[in-house]
């Protein structure tokens, strides 16, 4: 079978063919200082395209709680504080790992989980379809 | 200590009161369709603080490939298409969960890691300071 | 972005050859193990091949030994899959894949139909 090279005293799993489980370590390595999206920045209130943030909670993942931009206005605000629906405001998603339980409950073994969360909100010009 | 309560027939720890290392399912469960920043949406390039994205690849991460966004311009763009210095286009920044080898090179060994990337770029009111 | 673009199947007799081709674009090809992966009809995904970044490891699932040759080319971002005697049970989608770090696919293309038939 395909073999993956190995080094001395790494881990086994149970298929080196073809690995489907391995071995994480949760002693995160956090290459950042802030991780709240709230105090970072107040950009979510200066925008031109404001945003909210809810918070989406699931104690069966991790992170067990992510924090998703809702767009306040479908335009974005004008120089006079108004909504210009002449523009749009927009969504920029990102996608994201996570880690589910699974089996639920079990403390020690997790799925990796591909996942879509708006991180803020962005102002766009509208595309525009002419009708013939 | 504090125990996670544990269905009958999840894997076993060495530590079930804190648990360090977690066996993880690789058969990625991917809840999107499209995960190609560009393909996905043209935001980048229609936005009033439109961003470039730039590859951050790194073979022994997984994801391997991340783009970044770099903000365009230091203001926003206005409805003539001119560069408005009035305004501050700024990056929209996102944890993200990655995996990485550790020990190096070994394939069923990881660790996880915390990166903040820049999404996309929003265009906010800048803060002005009043000299007394 | 990344892309993988897989050419070169077709329909072939058995005992005929074909050789794949797959061009990489988005990443930096030659810090990846890249591998081809098949799927037949109606069956699972499964690993034909892979290849070392210098391309000085190659492994082979057994059923191809001796018959397939993985190969690449650096300089012009490519992969390879040269496949001889061929045979009826090597119909399949071939998939050009780039290899993650846990040793399975991170991406790959689109694919490209092989048959072998008389």
């Known amino acids: 079978g395909i073999t993956i090279p190995r080094n001395p005293g790494c881990p086994n799993s149970e298929d080196k063919n073809f690995p489907r489980t391995v071995m994480v370590n949760l002693n995160i390595h956090n290459r950042n200082t802030n991780t709240n999206p709230k105090r970072s920045s107040d950009y979510y209130n200066r925008s031109t395209s404001p945003w909210n943030l809810h918070r989406n909670e699931d104690p069966e993942r991790y992170p067990s709680v992510i924090w998703e931009a809702k767009c306040r206005h479908l335009g974005c605000i004008n120089a006079d504080g108004n909504v210009d629906y002449h523009m749009n405001s927009v969504p920029i998603q990102q996608e994201i790992l996570v880690l589910r339980r699974e089996p639920p409950h079990c403390p020690n073994s997790f799925r990796l989980e591909k996942i879509l969360v708006s991180v803020g909100c962005t102002c766009v010009t509208p595309i525009v379809h002419h009708v013939a | 200590g504090i125990t996670i309560p544990r269905n009958p027939g999840c894997p076993n720890s060495e530590d079930k009161n804190f648990p360090r290392t977690v066996m993880v399912n690789l058969n990625i469960h991917n809840r999107n369709t499209n995960t190609n920043p560009k393909r996905s949406s043209d935001y980048y390039n229609r936005s009033t603080s439109p961003w470039n994205l730039h590859r951050n690849e790194d073979p022994e991460r997984y994801p391997s490939v991340i783009w970044e966004a770099k903000c365009r311009h230091l203001g926003c763009i206005n409805a003539d298409g001119n560069v408005d210095y009035h305004m501050n286009s700024v990056p929209i920044q996102q944890e993200i969960l990655v995996l990485r080898r550790e020990p190096p090179h070994c394939p069923n060994s990881f660790r996880l890691e915390k990166i903040l990337v820049s999404v996309g770029c929003t265009c906010v009111t800048p803060i002005v300071h009043h000299v007394a | 972005q990344v892309q993988l673009v897989e050419s070169g199947g077709g329909l072939v007799q058995p005992g005929g050859s074909l050789r794949l081709s797959c061009a990489a674009s988005g990443f930096t090809f030659s810090s990846y193990w890249m591998s081809w992966v098949r799927q037949a009809p109606g069956k699972g995904l499964e690993w034909v091949a892979k290849i070392k970044q210098d391309g000085s490891e190659k492994d082979y699932v057994d059923s191809v030994k001796g018959r397939f040759t993985i190969s690449r080319d650096n300089a012009k971002n490519s992969l390879f899959l040269q496949m001889n005697s061929l045979r009826a049970e090597d119909t399949a989608v071939y998939y050009c894949?780039?290899?993650?770090?846990?040793?399975?696919?991170?991406?790959w293309g689109q694919g490209t139909l092989v048959t072998v038939s008389s």
């Open positions: 894949a780039r290899e993650s770090i846990f040793g399975i696919p991170e991406d």
